[in-house]
Interface confidence: medium
């Protein structure tokens, strides 16, 4: 395994809850350099498994706004622009990290939380169950 | 915006960087309740825009392991199982929050970071640019 020496300049925590409670710098560093997330912005409409984006807002959470994808159809859009029910539109899920204010309404105290979000939809071949 | 009354029981921060530096409870709460249980899926293989998952590991980041989707083809898989280049496989991207140890190798001091990850792929109709 990789052995990481402890940095001698680390902050020292005397907090009785250590290491459950730590200091986090919220001055967010954005690593999305040279990327253009806007490029994917119209995929929800152009996809053969199109989706709608629903705004999920929670002022007690950071980020407070999360967009949830909901597939528009059970089937997928075929070359004629019609829904083909021999294929399935399914949501692609991802577990993400958010911060929740704890206690509620506190500006400087949070708890880490994992939530499952649907990011978009993809078109899949269905699993056909044959009855014996 | 929504105005939230301050909870009188909030921890007080005397930190000179406040409100940039906050206390975070790392005892992760999992909100993936029974209403949204994780469904293990093989969508990456069954999709008309299939993808491979690549392991991105960074011991200084939480989560340390992130799986990145890379679309297998430029086109999409048609009903015959062949790649149709009249359609495009494109990655669905999402911006996620991660925690990075800061200073490096410190066990109890972190910084929030935003990174862009590809979660899966979807099949879209291409944008055709007509040359005058």
């Amino acid at each position: 395994g990789i052995t990481i020496p402890r940095n001698p300049g680390c902050p020292n925590s005397e907090d009785k809850n250590f290491p459950r409670t730590v200091m986090v710098n919220l001055n967010i560093h954005n690593r999305n350099t040279n990327t253009n997330p806007k490029r994917s912005s119209d995929y929800y409409n152009r996809s053969t498994s199109p989706w709608n984006l629903h705004r999920n807002e929670d002022p007690e959470r950071y980020p407070s706004v999360i967009w949830e994808a909901k597939c528009r159809h059970l089937g997928c859009i075929n070359a004629d622009g019609n829904v083909d029910y021999h294929m399935n539109s399914v949501p692609i899920q991802q577990e993400i990290l958010v911060l929740r204010r704890e206690p509620p309404h506190c500006p400087n105290s949070f708890r880490l939380e994992k939530i499952l979000v649907s990011v978009g939809c993809t078109c899949v071949t269905p699993i056909v169950h044959h009855v014996a | 915006g929504i105005t939230i009354p301050r909870n009188p029981g909030c921890p007080n921060s005397e930190d000179k960087n406040f409100p940039r530096t906050v206390m975070v409870n790392l005892n992760i709460h999992n909100r993936n309740t029974n209403t949204n249980p994780k469904r293990s899926s093989d969508y990456y293989n069954r999709s008309t825009s299939p993808w491979n998952l690549h392991r991105n590991e960074d011991p200084e980041r939480y989560p340390s392991v992130i799986w990145e989707a890379k679309c297998r083809h430029l086109g999409c898989i048609n009903a015959d199982g062949n790649v149709d280049y009249h359609m495009n496989s494109v990655p669905i991207q999402q911006e996620i929050l991660v925690l990075r140890r800061e200073p490096p190798h410190c066990p109890n001091s972190f910084r929030l970071e935003k990174i862009l990850v590809s979660v899966g792929c979807t099949c879209v109709t291409p944008i055709v640019h007509h040359v005058a």
């Epitope: 395994g1 499952l116 | 469904r39 293990s40 998952l53 590991e57 011991p59 392991v65 799986w67 979660v119």
Partner: antibody
Framework: EVQLVQSGAEVKKPGSSVKVSCKAS????????ICWVRQAPGQGLEWMGG????????DYAQKFQGRVTITADESTTTAYMELSGLTSDDTAVYYC???????????????????WGQGTTVTVSS | EIVLTQSPDFQSVTPKEKVTITCRAS??????LHWYQQKPDQSPKLLIK???HSVSGVPSRFSGSGSGTDFTLTINGLEAEDAGTYYC?????????FGPGTKVDIK
């Protein structure tokens, strides 16, 4: 290839404590959790608790709360399980197991125990 | 706390036979159910993860199915080396838990 190597067998007196180590090699230690599972003679598997190595904190089964301490030392890539107030009921084989602890992305597992140590036999006898 | 129950407790099987072991959870756990095999004096070994996903190095005769509360481990064409105890394990919610085990022996 990840390997988990545990410390040797222990014989302890009732009321005493035991500390078992689990040395991990291969892969990045902070990328996964280490769980401890015990198995009494002729019995099934029992989850005792686990440590998130990145943050260094542990979760414990209610049954062992207050009696067990699970820690991880990143500098030596070693996890420890200390059990105090031993009784004859604690005679068992103690296993450490790797918990990949990865965020769900629709397919890859987040919490299966994919690698196990060889087990450490702890005998409590007067 | 999520309780897992397994059936049967014990199964004596002839080689090449099909073996089916079931695991029931006391509440919905999605697909966060894993199967392990343990041979005498050995550590458990992961067989199936997330209810139905194969694990590299595990023979294809082992398969899993189910979601929610009811899960099945199937061994299609038992071999002599498959003798041992099989455990299900849930990772949906802390504390994690194991089923009581199903012992499979060869006739």
């Amino acid at each position: 290839e990840v390997q988990l190597v545990q410390s040797g067998a222990e014989v302890k007196k009732p009321g005493s404590s035991v500390k078992v180590s689990c040395k991990a090699s291969g892969g990045s230690f902070s990328s996964y959790g280490i769980c401890w599972v015990r198995q009494a003679p002729g019995q099934g598997l029992e989850w005792m608790g686990g440590v998130t190595t990145f943050f260094g904190f542990a979760d414990y089964a209610q049954k062992f709360q207050g009696r067990v301490t699970i820690t991880a030392d990143e500098s030596t890539t070693t996890a420890y399980m200390e059990l105090s107030g031993l009784t004859s009921d604690d005679t068992a084989v103690y296993y450490c197991a790797r918990d990949p602890n990865e965020f769900w992305n629709g397919y890859y597992a987040t919490h299966d125990f994919d690698y196990w140590g060889q087990g450490t036999t702890v005998t409590v006898s007067s | 706390e999520i309780v897992l129950t397994q059936s049967p407790d014990f199964q004596s099987v002839t080689p090449k036979e099909k073996v089916t072991i079931t695991c029931r959870a006391s509440q919905n756990i999605g697909s966060e159910l894993h199967w392990y095999q343990q041979k005498p004096d050995q550590s458990p070994k992961l067989l199936i993860k997330y209810a139905s996903h194969s694990v590299s190095g595990v023979p294809s005769r082992f398969s899993g199915s189910g979601s929610g509360t009811d899960f099945t481990l199937t061994i299609n064409g038992l071999e002599a080396e498959d003798a041992g105890t099989y455990y299900c394990h849930q990772s949906y919610m802390l504390p994690y838990s194991f089923g009581p085990g199903t012992k499979v022996d060869i006739k």
